[in-house]
């Protein structure tokens, strides 16, 4: 299996009740606006074939895509949560900047690409769905990167 390095986040990043609540609130607000409940972005298909030792690297890719292609373009929506949550997630992304995999990561990129394609295909509703799954993104980062 490919070896991942520097793919760790300190536990303290997830021990801040205020920003945790704001992240969950943002997800909840967006999920109320999500009419397509049959599609799941962060779930079994995303994780398929990816071992736990590679999972943090996978979630780093998802985090970066979510920030650049979803949260930044939608930054004027879902206030006041968005203005607090985006900088927090951006800090997590920065702390994972040196997280990489030595070896073949094609299976990971394939799974991430499917997520990206789904979001793009759904257009704005795909972006809303991604925001509505920020609680799952948060929990997946916590689960994989600590």
């Amino acid at each position: 299996a490919p070896i991942s390095s520097h793919c760790r986040l300190d536990k303290s990043n997830f021990q801040q009740p205020y920003i945790t609540n704001r992240t969950f609130m943002l997800a909840k607000e967006a999920s109320l606006a999500d009419n397509n409940t049959d599609v799941r972005l962060i779930g079994e298909k995303l994780f398929h074939g990816v071992s736990m030792s590679e999972r943090c690297y996978l979630m780093k890719q998802v985090l970066n895509f979510t920030l650049e292609e979803v949260l930044f373009p939608q930054s004027d929506r879902f206030q006041p949560y968005m203005q607090e949550v985006v900088p927090f997630l951006a800090r997590l992304s920065n702390r994972l900047s040196t997280c990489h995999i030595e070896g073949d990561d094609l299976h990971i990129q394939r799974n991430v690409q499917k997520l990206k394609d789904t979001v793009k295909k759904l257009g704005e509703s795909g972006e809303i769905k991604a925001i509505g799954e920020l609680d799952l993104l948060f929990m997946s980062l916590r689960n994989a990167c600590i």
Epitope: K11, F14, P17, T20, N21, T23, F24, M25, A27, K28, S31, T37, D38, R40, G43, E44, F47, S51, M52, R55, G132, E133, D135, L136, M139, S140, R142, N143, A144, I146
Partner: antibody, heavy 121, light 110 residues
Amino acid sequence: EVQLVESGGGVVRPGGSLRLSCAASGFTFDDYGMNWVRQAPGKGLEWVSGVNWNGGTRDYAASVKGRFTISRDNAKNSLYLQMNSLRAEDTALYYCARGWYSGAAWNMGYWGRGTLVTVSS
Amino acid sequence: QAVLTQPSSVSGSPGQSITISCTGASGDVGAYNFVSWYQQHPGKTPKLIIYDVNKRPSGVSNRFSGSKSGNTASLTISGLQAEDESDYYCASLVSDFSVVFGGGTKVTVL
């Protein structure tokens, strides 16, 4: 076939300690978060504690925090619950439970048969 | 500790549809993206029947469906059958990373 087998239950006096074990087989143990859930006789389900794949995060119900410690040994495919300062209200059947899919331990799709803990003087 | 409230009992005739509610306080921030439902027959271990609000594990009958609205999640059993007589529990991951179960609902098939 996924199998979870709990052991270590028994009768203990208030203030005493017990260590529960859960032996897992039939799946890649270190790909999954794990949980302990309990059920007092004739009562509902109560989540006790959960741990992620590598033991990096350990979460507890308020009722057991500071008294119980969850741990895992991936080399032995085993989950543990160290229970200290036991109280009468800890009397229950203790289940070991695995997440339905890897990455979401809170969806408990596989359960053991449980081990009974009785706290009584 | 967050609390999820379920009706203590619900009943219906064979072939009918019934719905079990699971309500949390408004302060249970964001919890309802993580709702799961369990079926437990007397003397048996719990069985996951719905996860992530509305997803069904493989092997679970499509007569079981989950949904949510606001702070209330719901489990609907359509085409009620005798074997559906059981206890049903909702559960949710909440924002302090603990999992909270509802008190359980006893379903009786008349």
